[in-house]
Amino acid sequence: KELKVTQPEKSVSVAAGDSTVLNCTLTSLLPVGPIRWYRGVGPSRLLIYSFAGEYVPRIRNVSDTTKRNNMDFSIRISNVTPADAGIYYCVKFQKGSSEPDTEIQSGGGTEVYVLAK
């Protein structure tokens, strides 16, 4: 099946201190390789979360990503602050061994607006 990364929401609004879910689904897990969430684009983009076993405070996967056929890589960000505002991209990589992982497809992005309480 052809790989497609889908972020259904173009934007979400969340009040400071609340939590929000950023949705991302894949149509295929192949080629094997990690899925990562970034804020922003280009060389200065910020890695927010990687589905490769690392612990990140305030961020959790929504579904059980240990299922071998899981294609839901949505995340929940808790206790949102104004600094969390920006456009978030769900990105699928093909594994690299001697070389770095190769980005093969990105979702369309979801803009997070943080509203004052």
Partner: antibody
């Protein structure tokens, strides 16, 4: 310290059943998929079954499908393998192993020996 | 099926390479597992093709390309004598497999 301790092995007759347990400690058990791997005497490693962190999804090698059942109780930090209709070919050391994010293994238990003999 | 040599030997200080073939780079991740005696607990020396657990010495490294994975031990020691199993996870079939094992003898 991370530990995986198997128990429940022993000597059984062909056709009988056995339930293996694996007690986990030193990590958040409910966050990890787990697997059972066995090693017959003088042979290599053979993956048998895996289970997702939440326990809803299970996976088996064809040769044990329908005879073996993997399960877990996250409230008890325990993994199980129910083995039915055992044959001499099931004689082996059985290991539980913690899975990495991409379903390889990073930690292994010490193993428990199962002997099927008449 | 994963294929690896039945045995390799080396003198202390030499570099040893064990090659495991038979996987598909597109759908497969590889790991390497050390077993010092039959029936003893395996120890993971490499997972995810090239990731070394924190308690494994840096002389162990892994790589993968094409349909093969390689375990390299740089400056092999007597205590590295063991059977090394390559393992693979296939994302196409959701199944794990192992090679038959390679006995490393340090002369």
């Amino acid at each position: 310290d991370l530990q995986l301790v198997e128990s429940g092995g022993g000597v059984v007759r062909p056709g009988e059943s056995l339930r293996l347990s694996c007690a986990a400690s030193g990590f958040t058990f409910s966050s990890y998929a787990m697997s059972w791997v066995r090693q017959a005497p003088g042979k290599g490693l053979e993956w048998l079954a895996g289970i997702s962190a939440g326990g809803s999804d299970t996976y088996y090698i064809d040769s044990v499908k329908g005879r073996f059942t993997i399960s877990r109780d996250n409230s008890k930090n325990s993994l199980y393998l129910q083995m039915n209709s055992l044959t001499a070919e099931d004689t082996a050391v059985y290991y539980c192993a913690r899975e990495t994010w991409n379903h390889l293994f990073d930690y292994w238990g010490l193993g428990t020996l199962v002997t099927v003999s008449s | 099926a994963l294929t690896q040599p039945a045995s390799v030997s080396a003198n202390p200080g030499e570099t040893v390479k064990i090659i495991c073939s038979g996987g598909d780079y597109y759908s497969t991740y590889y790991g390497w597992y050390q077993q010092k005696s039959p029936g003893s607990a395996p120890v993971t020396v490499i997972h995810s093709d090239d990731k070394r657990p924190s308690d494994i010495p840096s002389r162990f490294s892994g790589s993968a390309s094409g349909s093969a994975a390689t375990l390299t031990i740089t400056g092999v020691r007597v205590e590295d004598e063991a059977v090394y199993f390559c393992g693979a996870y296939d994302g196409r079939t959701y199944i794990n497999t192992f090679g038959a094992g390679t006995t490393l003898t340090v002369l």
